[in-house]
């Protein structure tokens, strides 16, 4: 014998108080699958959470975090504070990157500057708390007699199209 509730589609529930007929989910609730005997309460995105997707009769609301925070956990169950570039989030709050390390994002940890000399290159631009060093050509490339870099093509005058 088929369970009459199996005919109830998503967005409804099988109402035992009304001879197991399919009733629509009440406001602020949903059922994402058919054959449900109850509807689930919609998630409310409050406080540091903000609504990314409204609740419907067939799907739960989805939250993300307000500016200054980012999501953690399944389904954005938690919001973790952002730090500034040049900082990292420790257990006890945002801390500046130590000398020799950088972070160019608002989350994550400070990473060591690239060691240019490991690749036989020189430092072209020094690193900062926010930016990695930029490695330049190797000293051998700068020595006399080394093949020179091809010069750029001369720029065209404005308003002149190529013939």
């Amino acid at each position: 014998l088929q369970d009459p509730c199996s005919n109830c589609p998503a967005g409804t529930f099988c109402d035992n108080n009304r001879n197991q007929i399919c009733s629509p989910c009440p406001p602020n609730s949903f059922s994402s699958a058919g054959g449900q005997r109850t509807c689930d309460i919609c998630r409310q995105c409050k406080g540091v959470f903000r609504t990314r997707k409204e609740c419907s009769s067939t799907s739960n609301a989805e939250c993300d975090c307000t500016p200054g925070f980012h999501c953690l956990g399944a389904g954005c169950s938690m919001c973790e504070q952002d730090c500034k570039q040049g900082q990292e989030l420790t257990k006890k709050g945002c801390k500046d990157c130590c000398f020799g390390t950088f972070n160019d994002q608002k989350r994550g940890i400070c990473r060591p500057w690239t060691n240019c000399s490991l690749d036989g290159k020189s430092v072209l631009v020094n690193g900062t708390k926010e930016r990695d060093v930029v490695c330049g050509p190797s000293p051998a490339d700068l020595s006399p007699g080394a093949s020179s870099v091809t010069p750029p093509a001369p720029a065209r005058e404005p308003g002149h199209s190529p013939q």
Partner: nanobody
Amino acid sequence: EVQLLESGGGLVQSGGSLRLSCAASGFTFSSYAMSWVRQAPGKGLEWVSAISGSGGSTDYADSVKGRFTISRDNSTNTLYLQMNSLRAEDTAVYYCAKERAYDYSNYVDFDYWGQGTLVTVSS
């Protein structure tokens, strides 16, 4: 599958006490440090306390030092947080979190979280 299940939250008067538990399964519990973190209404995540795999080393946020005590029972795979002298500002959802190594780091470096248990402190 790693699972962390918190319990013990509830409504308590200011100055009162609660003991939170976190039942862990799906990994070698004694091999990993564990932490408690919390999220107060309208606020971001705040780390509360951490404990090493053996339980021999602990650390606390300044806001709970001297009031909260973290402990663990590796024979039953359970993490605890004893909370005394509770204040209204301790109201939050409390999560237990698995660290990635035997010793806890300075970083917010967790790979698994529980679903959380709500602690409400009324003044």
